[in-house]
């Protein structure tokens, strides 16, 4: 329970203004009314409160809104947002992109990735899906934030907005997120010509299945090694040496540099050594000549 102190008459607060910066923590607790604070939230960010004072103001809002803040308060949080935990944010219902922009600006330069991820999640839930306006806001104010969304949330992305996503927006996306985004991108770019298609689809290839990689290998795409290294391990392993050579084109030489790193290392272990030797790169670790490869996983699947 909170230790209660009475507000001295001369310290009574009738409006939220600059005079409050001179109040001690106990005085703020006793004298600032949470309902008044909520009604005048638009004034708070202009007042240079200390972090300790902001703590008190946060506790006041928590007192007033135990089930989470309404958007009328959230949009005016300003630097008070820095005091919020992901658990606090999870209680919010946010639909306004102006609110999202304001809070993304505040969070810049602070270690708040968990809070920002939760905020974006709440916006997507509040708006029903990750629509084009939300995606545009994220790419403009928080590059990389798209990848903070769960695969479940990303599944609501309509293919029509994929075109607005830039390569750098996907830099921090994990395999499960790319698994969701890749089919949408494939659909979005399906009417493009070969080279144009590859440029567009490249950032999403971390979610591509083996069949699509095989198809790409027939199109002289010359995939760069950075993109290859982001491909799903399971998608790369079934590719033959010839297919990888066609896929990478002149970049195939980079395999030597990456031969100790996944997925290259794992792929090498699956190839016949004499096939690897045809590349002339000195890649070692393939299956020795004369060895028979039994794929037990296939037998298990059949039995």
């Amino acid at each position: 329970d909170v230790e209660r102190t009475t507000c001295p008459p001369e310290k009574e607060v009738h409006e939220i203004d600059e005079s409050l910066i001179f109040y001690k923590k106990r005085e703020l607790e006793a004298c600032v009314d949470a309902a008044l604070l909520a009604a005048q939230m638009d004034r708070v960010d202009a007042i240079p409160f200390t972090y300790e004072q902001l703590d008190v103001l946060k506790h006041k809002l928590d007192e007033l809104y135990p089930q989470g803040y309404p958007e009328s308060v959230i949009r005016h949080l300003g630097h008070l947002f820095l005091k919020m935990s992901p658990e606090d944010i999870r209680k919010w219902n946010v639909t306004s992109l102006e609110t999202l922009k304001a809070l993304l600006k505040v969070s810049k330069g602070h270690e708040m990735s968990a809070q920002v991820a939760t905020l974006i999640d709440r916006v997507v839930v509040g708006r029903g899906q990750l629509d084009k306006d939300t995606a545009d806001t994220l790419t403009a104010f928080c590059p990389g934030c798209l990848c903070s969304l769960s695969p479940e949330r990303l599944s609501s992305v309509p293919p029509s907005i994929i075109g607005a996503v830039r390569p750098q927006d996907l830099d921090t996306c994990g395999p499960r997120q790319l698994d969701v985004l890749y089919p949408k991108a494939r659909l979005a770019f399906q009417n493009m010509s070969g080279s144009e298609y590859f440029v567009k689809i490249r950032p999403f290839l971390g979610g591509a299945p083996t069949e699509d990689l095989k198809a790409l290998s027939q199109q002289n795409v010359s995939m760069d090694l950075a993109t290859f290294m982001k491909l799903r391990r399971e998608a790369v392993l079934p590719l033959s040496v010839a297919e990888v050579q066609k896929l990478l084109g002149p970049h195939v030489e980079g395999l030597k540099v990456e031969e100790q790193h996944s997925p290259v290392r794992d792929w090498i272990l699956k190839q016949r050594q004499d096939d690897l030797d045809t590349l002339g790169l000195g890649l070692q670790g393939g299956i020795p000549n004369g060895y028979l490869i039994l794929d037990l996983s296939v037998r298990e699947a059949l039995s």
């Epitope: 009738h14 309902a35 008044l36």
Partner: antibody, heavy 119, light 108 residues
Framework: EVQLLESGGGLVQPGGSLRLSCAAS????????MSWVRQAPGKGLEWVSN????????NYADSVKGRFTISRDNNKNTLYLQMNSLRAEDTAVYYC????????????WGQGTLVTVSS | EIVLTQSPGTLSLSPGERATLSCRAS???????LAWYQQKPGQAPRLLIY???SRATGIPDRFSGSGSGTDFTLTISRLEPEDFAVYYC?????????FGQGTKVEIK
């Protein structure tokens, strides 16, 4: 079901004291702002006071400041209004009301208790 | 303090007619913090409208609220016999949380 039940009203002489109570049920009292509103006979509503749930921050109308004290007992789910130095103009029906912070309005009211200040 | 002035003081209308009640504030009030209440003789007030325009639970859609800044309106589109009562506006924008003096809607 939300219920607010006021008690403690009655006849008191000018200068006297009275303590009103409001028993609350059907909601989480410990999370809720509570208010007192009064209505003089044949007149309109007048906001009297309110109190916050955790810090027990209080606010008063100028007409009662220094004479009335609002308080609460979160363990008993009860709101109080201690009225001292009563005047004839304090004669009114006193309502206890729940403040809904999400609506910024008084969404539930008690039936009221009549306080008569007369000699 | 914010003074809320309601007009007219009394509105004499017949059932089925439209009622328009006004609430004017002496200084700007955020629409999120303006509410309307209905009170019938011998009863406690009842919340009708909060946030200037949102109907409280169980309130029929013939009641609507509008306005911003200093001018707010409560409209009853078609008066029913049970709507004849006194109506109050209230602001929670700053302390004290003042009420208007009320508008009585009576049967003509």
């Amino acid at each position: 079901e939300v219920q607010l039940l006021e008690s403690g009203g009655g006849l008191v002489q000018p200068g006297g004291s009275l303590r009103l109570s409001c028993a609350a049920s059907g909601f989480t009292f410990t999370h809720t702002y509570m208010s007192w509103v009064r209505q003089a006979p044949g007149k309109g509503l007048e906001w009297v006071s309110n109190i916050s749930p955790t810090y027990s921050t209080t606010n008063y109308a100028d007409s009662v400041k220094g004479r009335f004290t609002i308080s609460r007992d979160n363990n008993k789910n009860t709101l109080y209004l201690q009225m001292n130095s009563l005047r004839a103009e304090d004669t009114a029906v006193y309502y206890c009301a729940r403040y809904n912070a999400y609506h910024a309005a008084l969404d539930y009211w008690g039936q009221g208790t009549l306080v008569t200040v007369s000699s | 303090e914010i003074v809320l002035t309601q007009s007219p003081g009394t509105l004499s209308l017949s059932p089925g007619e439209r009622a328009t009640l006004s609430c004017r504030a002496s200084q700007s009030v955020s629409s999120s913090y303006l509410a309307w209440y209905q009170q019938k003789p011998g009863q406690a007030p009842r919340l009708l409208i909060y946030g200037a325009s949102s109907r409280a639970t169980g309130i029929p859609d013939r009641f609507s609220g509008s306005g911003s800044g200093t001018d707010f309106t409560l409209t009853i589109s078609r008066l029913e016999p049970e709507d004849f009562a006194v109506y109050y506006c209230q602001q929670h924008n700053q302390y004290p949380n003042t009420f208007g003096q009320g508008t009585k809607v009576e049967i003509k």
